[in-house]
């Protein structure tokens, strides 16, 4: 039978660490991490790490009992957890019978938004107590709400990941810029900022009709040339406060008729601010 892995939590040092080993298995040949989605009962889904590793193809894998994987996450707070993956059989060959290296994976470490993870793995038995053993580590930075997978998470939807404000902005005259955008039922307060290397104008927008999508319009006084300036729209939603996803547009000249500039010439540009 071919070896498989059985993985479970192991928070402290592995018991083998206390024992003296004449020989230990070699290090891993490769270690990779990628996010995968799994649905959960609430109708939302969670993002988990798929940690996969490749064993070095030589006789030292005959000594291999397990591989231990530890993950440290750094964002607002630090997290640390480890799993030990035991091999169900001794290795009878250095490569898979069908060809290629022995490759295993573990899916289970949860992934939070916008977090840097340090994933380390080592084979067991590992080095003796006062020796450095072979190990391998990789970094993985989880994406934020702008990511094509993450944006459908409930937390991100509530932070406006699926909201497209369709910003249009045009220079009415030397002193004012008209900004139009589609509101969202997620919140009723917005800040429109006009920047041309420095901030040349801003306005708070309060939209009382929170329950339905409407097209809001605001005329903003400016203190400098606004043509080509960037409009930044910051929403204030209950779930993300002042840290919601920001959207951008560009100021163009208003048409002579005085109506706002058509949408298709000025696509909204997602900003880089994430919850």
């Amino acid at each position: 039978r071919e070896p498989t892995v059985q993985c479970g939590s192991e928070t402290g040092p592995s018991p083998e660490w206390m024992l003296q080993h004449d020989l230990i298995p070699g290090d891993l040949r490769d270690l990779r991490v990628e996010p995968v989605t799994t649905s959960v009962a609430t109708g939302d889904y969670s993002i988990l790490m798929n940690v996969s590793w490749v064993l070095r193809a030589d006789a030292s894998i005959r000594l291999l009992k397990a591989t231990k994987i530890c993950v440290t996450g750094k964002s607002n707070f630090q997290s640390y957890s480890c799993v030990r993956c035991n091999y169900t059989e001794a290795f009878q060959t250095q490569t898979r019978p069908s060809g290629g290296k022995w490759t295993f994976s573990y899916i289970g470490f949860p992934v939070e938004l916008n977090t840097v993870y340090f994933i380390g793995a080592h084979n067991i038995p590992n080095a003796n107590m006062n020796e450095d053993g072979p190990s391998m580590s990789v970094n993985f930075t989880s994406p934020g709400c702008l990511d094509h997978i993450m944006k459908y998470k409930k937390k991100c939807v509530k932070a406006g990941s699926l909201w497209d404000p369709n910003i249009t902005a045009c220079k009415k005259n030397e002193e004012t810029v008209e900004v139009n955008f589609t509101t969202t039922p997620l919140g009723n307060r917005y800040m429109a900022l006009i920047q041309h290397s420095t901030i040349i104008g801003f306005s708070q927008v309060f939209e009382p009709h929170q329950k339905k999508q409407t097209r809001a319009s605001v005329v903003i006084p400016v203190t400098g040339d606004s043509e080509g300036a960037t409009v930044q729209l910051t929403p204030y939603f209950p779930t993300c406060g002042s840290d919601c996803i920001r959207h951008k547009g560009t100021v163009v000249l208003c048409p002579q008729t005085g109506v706002p500039f058509p949408l298709d010439n000025n696509k909204s540009k997602p900003g880089g601010w994430l919850p």
Epitope: L23, A57, D58, A59, R62, T93, Q94, S98, G99, G100
Partner: antibody, heavy 118, light 107 residues
């Protein structure tokens, strides 16, 4: 029946390169590492390196690093060993040898004599 | 690199004799050892692997023993076709090395 059939004898001048082929049959080529071993006249066996035909991972003996190149062509189940900057002490019989479950050499080619002479 | 030291480098024996060849590794190779037989002008032939396992078609008069760093190949009753050179090889991990060989000659 597992067979490893090597290319014929070569005579080369110092500084030249030689490429030896090893055509395999009777087993799944990508399932076993292929090793190269040489034997100078009247001398013992010397391991040069190995290649995993599955993904072309290669490991060389330090002595040959930078001078030997191992390749493979899975479409014709053939492994190759190229040795460059030949010297007279590279005169030897070169063998391909297929690994077993681990790196004992279960099957050998018939050998290719490479003579380096000016 | 692991060094493999074989002894003796040559020996003379008669048909029917019991022959023992030893191989010492410079460090523990955890029984990852193979023995080969080579006749003049021919490729080596695998005799034993994992110290004691006979390769396909190898007569039972060949046997192996040992562990750690010290290993032995024994031919219980030497036959005329056994006159050849014998090599040990470790496969604990690359680079793989062979012993210097033991030539078994007719007395």
């Amino acid at each position: 029946e597992v067979q490893l059939v090597q290319s014929g004898a070569e005579v080369k001048k110092p500084g030249a390169s030689v490429k030896v082929s090893c055509k395999t049959s009777g087993y799944t080529f990508i399932s076993y590492w292929m090793n190269w071993v040489r034997q100078a006249p009247g001398q013992g066996l010397e391991w040069m390196g190995r290649i995993d035909p599955y993904d072309s991972e290669i490991q060389y003996a330090q002595k040959f690093q930078g001078r030997v190149t191992l390749t493979r062509d899975t479409s014709i189940s053939t492994a190759y060993m190229e040795l460059s900057r030949l010297r007279s002490d590279d005169t030897a019989v070169y063998y391909c040898a297929r690994s077993g479950g681990f790196d004992w050499f279960a099957y050998w080619g018939q050998g290719t004599l490479v003579t380096v002479s000016s | 690199d692991i060094q493999m030291t074989q002894s003796p480098s040559s020996l003379s024996a008669s048909v029917g004799d019991r022959v023992t060849i030893t191989c010492r590794a410079s460090e523990n190779i955890n029984s990852n050892l193979a023995w080969y037989q080579q006749k003049p002008g021919k490729a080596p032939k695998l005799l034993l692997y994992d110290v004691t396992n006979l390769a396909d078609g190898v007569p039972s008069r060949f046997s192996g023993s040992g562990s750690g760093t010290d290993y032995t190949l024994t031919i219980s009753s030497l036959q005329p076709e056994d006159f050849a050179t014998y090599y040990c090889q470790h496969f604990w991990g690359p680079p793989y090395t062979f012993g210097g060989g033991t030539k078994v000659e007719i007395k």
